[in-house]
């Protein structure tokens, strides 16, 4: 119904009030629900109302505002501290101890986070985003610096329908359209061979407890697994001679092991040259990601931090030991 300059929606009536014409909903079930657009954020509950905007939000603390969009810091919450002597003793021994796997304890001194003590260091959200990995979207954490809220704002994240088939045919130089989707890793870019690469700045340097020959043999699965976590595509970097940058890694024994070594006589060359795993240099190719998503990594810093976040959660399917983001072209180092 028309109400002067004001246009009322279906089911609403025009009421002339002292402050001018207003729309009013006499029976909410006959009107478009303001809740239809899910306006209440951060888990707030929506209640239909008779007056515009036809909803009200009941916010869950610590949020407020008409759409629960405002974060209100609890009054003087003391910063969490890692009080336990137990954790001080266990930190940086190369083993992740769940009792110390907290932000306050630097994720067991980096033992639970691929040696990265603060993956959220660049996250300026008022929320402690590490505590909001909760299978629901928290927009205040949905930034690259806050690791895209662990990709929890992607709507219902789909799973790859033909996962086994797509895994077997990933990056095999043959385009399988049934696998050419974000959730299936864009078929390892098999369907985008004619498109120009779109490389993120920097290099991911990962240490994984698999010898080079085994890692290279399993490279497609390895790249697919990490690409799935990062929602983009990865490839092994090549050096100036065109060789894949996968090198034997001899291990950096932890402080615990160094201490142990000093207490007994080592045999000549004992375990010194034994290959513990591989050091692999990876690049991110966003050529498909940028077409389907606005959650792509422009550089490898946040990608490294997201892998560390997955390590904290225990959701890595490969024995990664450390991850570093290198901005410059790396020398071949062990």
């Amino acid at each position: 119904s028309s109400c002067g300059q004001v246009k009322c929606r279906k089911g609403e009536q025009c009421v002339h009030t002292a402050s001018g014409p207003r729309c009013f909903c006499p029976s909410p079930r006959d009107c478009e629900s303001g809740c239809a657009s899910s306006p209440c954020q951060h888990g707030g509950s929506c209640h239909p109302q008779r007056q515009p905007p036809y909803y009200s939000c009941q916010c869950a603390p610590p949020f407020s505002g008409s759409r629960c969009e405002l974060y209100t810091a609890p009054p003087s919450t003391p910063p969490a501290t890692c009080l336990s002597q137990y954790c001080a003793d266990k930190a940086r021994d190369g083993v992740c101890d769940e009792a110390c796997n907290s932000h306050a304890c630097q994720w067991d001194g980096g033992d639970c986070s691929l040696t990265m003590e603060n993956p959220w260091a660049n996250c300026s959200s008022p929320l402690p985003c590490w505590d909001y990995i909760n299978n629901q979207c928290d927009e205040l954490c949905n930034t690259v610096e806050c690791l895209f809220d662990n990709f929890e704002c992607q709507g219902n994240s789909k799973t790859c329908k033909y996962d086994k088939y797509c895994a077997d045919h990933f990056k095999d130089n043959h385009c399988d359209q049934g696998c050419n989707s974000e959730e299936c890793g864009w078929d390892g870019l098999d369907c985008a061979a004619d498109q120009p690469e779109n490389l993120a700045e920097g290099t991911l340097v990962i240490v994984v407890l698999m010898p080079p020959e085994q890692l290279l043999q399993d490279a497609r699965s390895f790249l697919r697994a990490l690409g799935t976590l990062l929602h983009t595509n990865l490839r092994i970097k090549r050096d100036s001679q065109g060789e894949l940058m996968v090198y034997p890694y001899y291990g950096e024994k932890s402080a615990a092991m160094k201490k142990q070594r000093m207490t007994r006589r080592s045999l000549p060359g004992e375990q010194e040259q034994e290959v513990a795993g591989s050091k692999v240099f990876l690049e991110i190719d966003n050529r498909q990601c940028v077409q389907d998503s606005d959650h792509c990594f422009k550089n490898t810093d946040a990608a490294a931090a997201l892998l560390a976040s997955h390590a904290i959660q225990g959701t890595l399917s490969y024995p990664l030991v450390s991850v570093v983001s290198e901005s410059l072209t790396p020398e071949r180092t062990q």
């Epitope: 137990y86 190369g94 992740c96 101890d97 769940e98 932890s254 092991m257 513990a276």
Partner: antibody, heavy 122, light 107 residues
Framework: EVQLVESGGGLVQPGGSLRLSCAAS????????MSWVRQAPGKGLEWVSY????????YYADSVKGRFTISADTSKNTAYLQMNSLRAEDTAVYYC???????????????WGQGTLVTVSS | DIQMTQSPSSLSASVGDRVTITCRAS??????LAWYQQKPGKAPKLLIY???TRESGVPSRFSGSGSGTDFTLTISSLQPEDFATYYC?????????FGQGTKVEIK
């Protein structure tokens, strides 16, 4: 097939020493933590010690700290438990068991050896 | 150390019965709890980890639930091969401690 085989058990006098071995096969030995768990005759299970072969980090139960030493030889895919100053209460079947979660001590033990009996008696 | 208290310590049941074993931790262990089955003269076998995830190859009649301090192992329909001793174990904090065990016997 992932397999753990213990050896080295036997009869020893109180105050004596014994070294148990646990030979692992069928998986990447360096990648997974290993624990020793014991069971006294007719009793329940008791966790004894843990090692992460990659970093060499070790953990012990208070009841064995200072007397037992866990170690690993990654070239032989074998974990060891060196037991010194043995007491009658150390009599038990000793099992080695692999942790399921790579570098996480906070993971369940998914593969167990058959056990080796250690008897401490005069 | 975290104490784990299992109950009952033993129970008698018949084939086809529904059996429930409980385990209580002396402090919050989140969901870092495993259940093991052990038969006489054999090594323990992992049934459940993460409080409720069945280990691969374990029959669906075994289920686990709980978080924090209170946990349950349920065998929905007891089979002849299920007569054994069951242990819970917390792996949240070292030393990892076991419950004292529950022996499931034939009635």
């Amino acid at each position: 097939e992932v397999q753990l085989v213990e050896s080295g058990g036997g009869l020893v006098q109180p105050g004596g020493s014994l070294r148990l071995s646990c030979a692992a096969s069928g998986y990447s030995f360096t990648s997974y933590g290993m624990s020793w768990v014991r069971q006294a005759p007719g009793k329940g299970l008791e966790w004894v010690s843990y090692i992460y072969p990659y970093s060499g980090a070790t953990y012990y139960a208070d009841s064995v700290k200072g007397r037992f030493t866990i170690s690993a030889d990654t070239s032989k895919n074998t974990a060891y438990l060196q037991m010194n100053s043995l007491r009658a209460e150390d009599t038990a079947v000793y099992y080695c068991a692999r942790h399921s979660g790579y570098y996480r001590i906070s993971s369940a033990m998914d593969v167990w050896g058959q056990g080796t009996l250690v008897t401490v008696s005069s | 150390d975290i104490q784990m208290t299992q109950s009952p310590s033993s129970l008698s049941a018949s084939v086809g019965d529904r059996v429930t074993i409980t385990c209580r931790a002396s402090q919050n262990i989140k969901r870092f709890l495993a259940w093991y089955q052990q038969k006489p003269g054999k090594a323990p076998k992992l049934l459940i980890y993460g409080a409720s995830t069945r280990e691969s190859g374990v029959p669906s009649r075994f289920s686990g639930s709980g978080s924090g301090t209170d946990f349950t192992l349920t065998i929905s329909s007891l089979q002849p091969e299920d007569f054994a001793t069951y242990y819970c174990q917390q792996y949240y904090r070292s030393p990892h401690t076991f419950g004292q065990g529950t022996k499931v016997e034939i009635k």
